[in-house]
Interface confidence: low
């Protein structure tokens, strides 16, 4: 007869490991007992359990409560045992010794490998601002046994760099993602992907990129100069900009206070029926936590009685 076992048994941390040992004998042969021991190189054998055909399972004190027989039905030629709740320290070489009648004793070895799945963490880098050079967007760290793979999944252009630290029973891998911040990256996901043989599927942690910026400001509403005449209703100026964080708007008049009846509604300046009092230089001030911008326009309200052309001056300043 001969013993059937596995060269390597792989189990995830915390799971139960089945240590296989089956005697495939000739007709009429019987197994008297099966002894299991741990036999790591350089150390003496440490008994786990003894499985006796007549007296059942005896577990050594060091493994009390952790070694069991597989659930029924059981084959009398099967000397396999279950090692409950595998921990990293269980990783190593194991030997089963089978005493048979009348063929004698047989032994076989296997290696138990305990996978420690990583618990990845993602740390965003410093605040991203448009105009910065190559900047750390995020770093992702995962520690496990064996060493996990850490990669990035994103549509954003950037560069990655990885480093690994080996510990006695595991390895920590850190990957950094660097980019040159631009406003088009706002809201884009940057996903750290961690692969490991102990994971059923890749673990993914997503960081949403937020790049502070403020676009140049401009004012709309003066495109048709002839509309800005005395008595016109519904005239308005609209300040155009965009930013992250979303900006706030403020309107002032450069050559005095805003005329009475002029309505400020966020980015829009609404005028009552136009009079010559509404002529002047208006400034839209756009700001967010990152920056501020100004845009000024000159409004010249036409008097239809006079045949004078209206002049419009547009100036943008940062």
């Amino acid at each position: 007869g001969e013993l059937e076992t596995s060269d390597v048994v792989t189990v995830v941390l915390g799971q139960d490991a089945k240590l296989p040992c089956f005697y495939r004998g000739d007709s009429g042969e019987q197994v008297g007992q099966v002894a299991w021991a741990r036999v790591d190189a350089g150390e003496g054998a440490q008994e786990l359990a003894l499985l006796h055909s007549k007296y059942g399972l005896h577990v050594s004190p060091a493994y009390e409560g952790r070694v069991e027989q597989p659930p029924p039905p059981r084959n009398p030629l099967d000397g396999s045992v279950l090692l409950r709740n595998a921990v990293q320290a269980d990783e190593g070489e194991y030997e089963c010794r089978v005493s048979t009648f009348p063929a004698g004793s047989f032994q076989a070895r296997l290696r138990l490998r305990v996978l420690v799945p990583p618990l990845p963490s993602l740390n965003p880098g410093p605040a991203l601002e448009e105009g910065q050079g190559l900047t750390l967007a995020a770093s992702c760290t995962a520690e496990g046994s064996p060493a996990p793979s850490v990669t990035w999944d994103t549509e954003v252009k950037g560069t990655t760099s990885s480093r690994s630290f080996k510990h006695s029973r595991s390895a920590a891998v850190t990957s950094e993602f660097h980019l040159v911040p631009s406003r088009s990256m706002n809201g884009q996901p940057l996903t750290c992907v961690v692969s490991h043989p102990g994971l059923l599927q890749d673990q993914r942690i997503t960081h949403i990129l937020h790049v502070s910026f403020l676009a140049e400001a401009s004012v709309r509403g003066l495109e048709d100069q002839n509309l800005w005449h005395i008595g016109r209703e519904g005239a308005m100026l609209k300040c155009l900009s965009e930013g992250q964080p979303p900006p706030s708007y403020n309107w002032t008049r450069l050559d005095g206070p805003l005329p009475s009846g002029v309505r400020v509604d966020g980015d829009t300046l609404g005028f009552p029926p136009l009079t010559t009092e509404h002529s002047g230089i208006y400034v839209c001030h756009v700001s967010n936590e990152f920056s501020s911008r100004d845009s000024q326009v000159t409004v010249d309200v036409l008097d239809p009685q006079e045949d004078s052309g209206k002049q419009v001056d547009l100036v943008s300043a940062s």
Partner: antibody
């Protein structure tokens, strides 16, 4: 005009997989993100995940082990799978469109899914 | 995840009333907030994004304001078609929604 329409079985057995399809028209799924959101009386509106214009996916951490989102660009379809469903997965499931941000400018009409034996 | 707390959960109002709904985030969301309107049996409809920007086709009686953690949706003069449930939603990271505010006829 922009339209999204969800389809799939209205009844799913507990522990089975819920599979839904979102068919879109009026825009290209290679230019916009398509998200899945569900709504139930007990939990309100919950964002489940997204497949972005480039094909990458992101999932709500609470569902990451159970959700898979994929797509067929040629058919303008996005597919949603939720494994190991239980009674508390009973909800109206919506697909919705976004740009690069996570706000949703167009929604499907929703499809009611009941998990029951 | 960031939690969104919406108040009130319901309110009664009359046509022509000014209605204010508030939403508080558990941390700064930097104006990355949207508001939606939902009517029974229908999908939510985007009203406001980035806290203050009105979505296309939304009447000007709707407006959004706020910054940091506190945000407000205002309906300046309630119309019959405005009776619905309103939700806020942040998009600063994994999106989450508020619990909703049901606006009912008084």
């Amino acid at each position: 005009q922009v339209q999204l329409k969800e389809s799939g079985p209205g009844l799913v057995q507990p522990s089975e997989t819920l599979s839904l399809t979102c068919t879109v028209s009026g825009f290209s799924i290679t230019n916009y993100g398509v998200h899945w959101i569900r709504q139930s009386p007990g939990k309100g509106l919950e964002w489940l995940g997204v497949i972005w214009s480039g094909g990458s996916t992101d999932y709500n951490a609470a569902f990451v082990s159970r959700v898979t989102i994929s797509r067929d660009n040629s058919k303008s379809q996005v597919f949603f799978k939720l494994n190991s469903v239980q009674a508390d997965d009973t909800a109206v499931y919506y697909c919705a469109r976004s740009g690069k941000w996570y706000y949703f400018d167009y929604w499907g009409q929703g499809t009611t899914v009941t998990v029951s034996s | 995840d960031i939690q969104m707390t919406q108040s009130p959960s319901s309110l009664s109002a009359s046509v022509g009333d000014r209605v204010t709904i508030t939403c508080r985030a558990s941390e700064n969301i930097y104006s990355n907030l949207a508001w939606y309107q939902q009517k029974p049996g229908k999908a939510p409809k985007l009203l406001v994004y980035a806290a203050t920007n009105l979505a296309d086709g939304v009447p000007s009686r709707f407006s959004g304001s706020g910054s940091g953690t506190d945000y407000t949706l205002t309906i300046s003069s309630l119309q019959p078609e405005d009776f619905a449930t309103y939700y806020c939603q942040h998009f600063w990271g994994t999106p989450t929604f508020g619990g909703g505010t049901k606006v009912e006829i008084k």
